[in-house]
Interface confidence: medium
């Protein structure tokens, strides 16, 4: 069977006027997953995103992440897209320093 990922979106200050937004998917099985940032309704090009490896997390499931740098104040233009085992979800950038994390339910 498959285990849906927990998706967690965070933000951190990068430089003056910029923030880094990171989308983490964890505790999923099998390891095949699509994780990408979308801006203005369309996926960002590969060269503007950084991906982590898909790694075992020690519980028989996997974890990975994708990050990109964006201009502060433009957070509403960005969403993290996740697809796993035929199910997909989108996750907004949290405002301020809060975190968003939740399971994607089948």
């Amino acid at each position: 069977g498959s285990v849906p990922p927990m998706v967690n979106v965070t933000r951190s200050e990068a430089s003056e006027g910029n923030i880094t937004v990171t989308c983490r998917a964890s505790s999923f099985y099998p390891r095949n997953i699509t994780l990408t940032w979308r801006q203005d309704g369309v996926s960002l090009s590969h060269d503007t995103q950084q991906w982590g490896d898909v790694l075992p997390d020690g519980n028989g499931t996997y974890q990975t992440w994708v990050a990109t740098r964006i201009c502060q104040g433009e957070e509403q233009r960005f969403t993290c897209y996740m697809e796993h085992s035929g199910n997909h979800s989108t996750h907004p950038v949290p405002s301020g320093n809060s975190h968003h994390h939740h399971h994607h339910h089948h």
Partner: antibody, heavy 119, light 107 residues
Framework: DVQLQESGPGLVKPSQSLSLTCTVT?????????WNWIRQFPRNKLEWMGY???????NYNPSLKSRISITRDTSKNQFFLQLISVTTEDTATYYC????????????WGQGTLVTVSA | DIQMTQSPASLSASVGETVTITCRAS??????LAWYQQKQGKSPQLLVY???MLADGVPSRFSASGSGTQYSLKINSLQPEDFGSYYC?????????FGAGTKVEIK
């Protein structure tokens, strides 16, 4: 409802610049959305050209990047297409449209304006 | 770039028939697909977005399906007002691209 209306010269000479205007009513182009130009060639092929979004950021089709510019006049709620060094291959019906950020599909289009490039 | 291949290029059908138009993407577009209808001399009109969702005001005889790289638009009980050209468009990544179109003509 958002309404869009294209305008501009219907005939342009080769090597010159093509300039078109899209006038938007019913919504402020600085409020939200991506404001796009799309063209349809005589044999009906559709090509997305690019957009200017609510904050003034532009994004262009790489196939046109060296020739295209999309700008705006927020006081008139208009956005513009300029295409330089045109050839007869740029003869097309030019449409303006917009999309929301829940996905880049085009809910409404202008009526289109035919531009013929000919000497 | 993701290329969109539509088939057939044209078809002839009678009022009341069911027709299906297909669209194949050169890569996985994850259901980020729209369908448009265009009548002669008019602008394209949105029919479907997100691969399966009918736009406001679109009759229920239209339906759409698909996933990955393969998508289809089905018209049940074709009506006179359904004749025209149909285009698919992906919006997974830039540049946005359209299929070459399918012309639905009266038999």
């Amino acid at each position: 409802d958002v309404q869009l209306q294209e305008s501009g010269p219907g005939l342009v000479k080769p090597s010159q610049s093509l300039s078109l205007t899209c006038t938007v009513t019913g919504y402020s182009i600085t409020s939200d959305y991506a404001w796009n130009w799309i063209r349809q060639f005589p044999r009906n092929k559709l090509e997305w050209m690019g957009y200017i979004n609510y904050s003034g950021t532009t994004n262009y089709n790489p196939s046109l990047k060296s020739r295209i510019s999309i700008t705006r006049d927020t006081s008139k709620n208009q956005f513009f297409l300029q295409l330089i060094s045109v050839t007869t291959e740029d003869t097309a019906t030019y449409y303006c449209s917009y999309y929301r950020y829940d996905g880049a599909w085009f809910p409404y289009w202008g009526q289109g304006t035919l531009v013929t490039v000919s000497a | 770039d993701i290329q969109m291949t539509q088939s057939p290029a044209s078809l002839s059908a009678s009022v009341g028939e069911t027709v299906t138009i297909t669209c194949r993407a050169s890569g996985n577009i994850h259901n980020y697909l729209a369908w448009y209808q265009q009548k002669q001399g008019k602008s394209p009109q949105l029919l479907v977005y997100n691969a399966i969702m009918l736009a406001d005001g679109v009759p229920s005889r239209f339906s759409a399906s698909g996933s990955g790289t393969q998508y289809s638009l089905k018209i049940n009980s074709l009506q006179p007002e359904d004749f025209g050209s149909y285009y698919c468009q992906h919006f997974w990544s830039f540049p946005l691209t359209f299929g070459a179109g399918t012309k639905v003509e009266i038999k």
